[in-house]
C-alpha cells in the first residue's frame, strides 16, 4: 500500500502518527523502490543501461535537474527556494511519468503506483511550501504535444527514453530526499 | 536462419475483406517486432503498421486506421493482416517484415517475399 | 510526418564508376546521437534488401562498394565501383519516428 494510503499507519497501535516531513520521507523511499523494480525490468529487456550514447542522449530530454542555483545542496541551501524546485521538478516530471504508463510489460501496476504516489508526494510539499506562487505549473498544451512526440518514437528510442526518465528522477528524488531531511 | 513466410496472392472483389499471413521461423518471434508495408504497383513503399507480437499491442499509420487490422497467434508464430472494404486503391504487395534491433539503430532486416492483392470486379 | 525526399528519380552509371544517391529528410532524423536512416535495395519481384542502417552501418554480407552518409537531415548512399548486379530500386527511409517513411526511390541502371 502506498504511504500515502496510511493503511499501515491505521492498523499499528501504539506508534506516533507520523509527522510531516517522516510522511514526505517516507513517500520518496516508496516511489524509489518503485523506480528500482521499473529499472530493473527495463534493463533485463534491453541493453539501454549499458549504453554509451548516454551523455549525448541528456540533450534530448529536458528532464528536471538539480543546479547549484537551486538551492538544494549543501553549499548555498536555501529551504524556500528549494522547496520550489522539487515541487515544480516533480510537476514537470508528470508528463513523462504519464509516459511510463504502457511501457512496462510485467511491472505495469508499478509504473501506475509511482505516477500515482508521486501525485500525493506533490501535495504533500505543497502544503509545507509557503511560496507557492513561486511554483510555475506546466502548460497542458505543451505537455500533450511532448507526449505525443514521445510516443511516436521507434522501439530503441522508447526504451532509450524510458532508462532515461527513470535514472533522471532517481537522481532527483535522491537529491530531494537529501535536501528535505535538512529542512 | 530467420524467415518470414507470407501466404499466397488473393484476387478479392471491391467491398470484399482479405486476411493474409506471414509465418515466422529462425528467431524467438516474441522478441521482435512485426511491422507491415505496402508497395502498389511501380511505386514507392508505406508503413501501414507494426505490431508487438509478446503483448499484441500495435501502432497503426493513421491513413490505415480502420483499413488494416494486426494480429499475431504467438502459439504458431504467425502474423496476419487483415484489410476490410477493399477499392482498387488497395491493389498492391503486401509485405511483413521483421524489426532488426541494433546497437545503434533500428530497420527492418528480414522481409517476407510479399503478398499480391488484386481488386477486381 | 517526416517527408523523405529522394533524388534523383533515375540514375544511370558506368560500370566501375560512383553513383550518388541522395535522401533529405524534413526535419532531423537524428536522436541519442544516433540517425535513424536507412537504405534498402529492391530487385523487380523482390522484397527490399537492408543494405545500410543508422545512416552509415554496413548489413553484413552487404558488400564494401555500398556505404551511407549523412546526418541530420541530409543523406546519402555510395555506390563504388558500379556492377552489373547493382542495377535495381534504391529506398531511403527513416525509422526515428511513426509513421515510418520512405523516399520515392532512384532507379539505378548501368549506363
Known amino acids: 500500500v502506498p504511504p500515502g494510503e496510511d493503511s499501515k499507519d491505521v492498523a499499528a497501535p501504539h506508534r506516533q502518527p507520523l509527522t510531516s516531513s517522516e510522511r514526505i520521507d517516507k513517500q520518496i523511499r516508496y516511489i524509489l523502490d518503485g523506480i528500482s523494480a521499473l529499472r530493473k525490468e527495463t534493463c533485463n529487456k534491453s541493453n539501454m543501461c549499458e549504453s554509451s550514447k548516454e551523455a549525448l542522449a541528456e540533450n534530448n530530454l529536458n528532464l528536471p535537474k538539480m543546479a547549484e542555483k537551486d538551492g538544494c545542496f549543501q553549499s548555498g541551501f536555501n529551504e524556500e527556494t528549494c522547496l520550489v524546485k522539487i515541487i515544480t521538478g516533480l510537476l514537470e516530471f508528470e508528463v513523462y511519468l504519464e509516459y511510463l504508463q504502457n511501457r512496462f510489460e510485467s511491472s505495469e501496476e508499478q509504473a501506475r503506483a509511482v505516477q500515482m504516489s508521486t501525485k500525493v508526494l506533490i501535495q504533500f510539499l505543497q502544503k509545507k511550501a509557503k511560496n507557492l506562487d513561486a511554483i510555475t505549473t506546466p502548460d497542458p498544451t505543451t505537455n500533450a504535444s511532448l507526449l505525443t512526440k514521445l510516443q511516436a518514437q521507434n522501439q530503441w528510442l522508447q526504451d532509450m527514453t524510458t532508462h532515461l526518465i527513470l535514472r533522471s528522477f532517481k537522481e532527483f528524488l535522491q537529491s530531494s530526499l537529501r535536501a528535505l531531511r535538512q529542512m | 536462419e530467420v524467415q518470414l513466410q507470407q501466404s499466397g496472392p488473393e484476387l478479392v472483389k471491391p467491398g470484399a475483406s482479405v486476411k493474409m499471413s506471414c509465418k515466422a521461423s529462425?528467431?524467438?518471434?516474441?522478441?521482435?517486432?512485426m511491422k507491415w508495408v505496402k508497395q502498389s504497383h511501380g511505386k514507392s513503399l508505406e508503413w501501414i503498421g507494426e505490431?508487438?507480437?509478446?503483448?499484441?499491442?500495435?501502432r497503426y499509420n493513421q491513413k490505415f486506421k480502420g483499413k488494416a487490422t494486426m494480429t499475431v497467434d504467438k502459439s504458431s508464430s504467425t502474423a496476419y493482416m487483415q484489410l476490410n472494404s477493399l477499392t482498387s486503391e488497395d491493389s498492391a504487395v503486401y509485405y511483413c517484415?521483421?524489426?532488426?534491433?541494433?546497437?545503434?539503430?533500428?530497420?527492418?532486416?528480414?522481409w517476407g517475399q510479399g503478398t499480391s492483392v488484386t481488386v477486381s470486379s | 510526418e517526416l517527408v523523405m525526399t529522394q533524388s534523383p528519380a533515375s540514375l544511370a552509371v558506368s560500370l566501375g564508376q560512383r553513383a550518388t544517391i541522395s535522401c533529405r529528410a524534413s526535419?532531423?532524423?537524428?536522436?541519442?546521437?544516433?540517425?535513424?536512416m536507412n537504405w534498402f535495395q529492391q530487385k523487380p519481384g523482390q522484397p527490399p534488401k537492408l543494405l545500410i542502417y543508422?545512416?552509415?552501418n554496413q548489413v553484413s554480407g552487404v558488400p564494401a562498394r555500398f556505404s551511407g552518409s549523412g546526418s541530420g537531415t541530409d543523406f546519402s548512399l555510395n555506390i563504388h565501383p558500379m556492377e552489373e548486379d547493382d542495377t535495381a530500386m534504391y529506398f531511403c527511409?527513416?525509422?526515428?519516428?511513426?509513421?515510418?517513411?520512405f523516399g520515392g526511390g532512384t532507379k539505378l541502371e548501368i549506363k
Open positions: 529462425g528467431y524467438t518471434f516474441t522478441d521482435y517486432y
Open positions: 517484415a521483421r524489426v532488426g534491433y541494433y546497437a545503434e539503430g533500428y530497420a527492418m532486416d528480414y
Open positions: 526535419e532531423s532524423v537524428d536522436s541519442y546521437g544516433i540517425s535513424f
Open positions: 527511409q527513416q525509422s526515428k519516428e511513426v509513421p515510418y517513411t
Open positions: 543508422a545512416a552509415s
Open positions: 505490431i508487438n507480437p509478446k503483448s499484441g499491442g500495435s
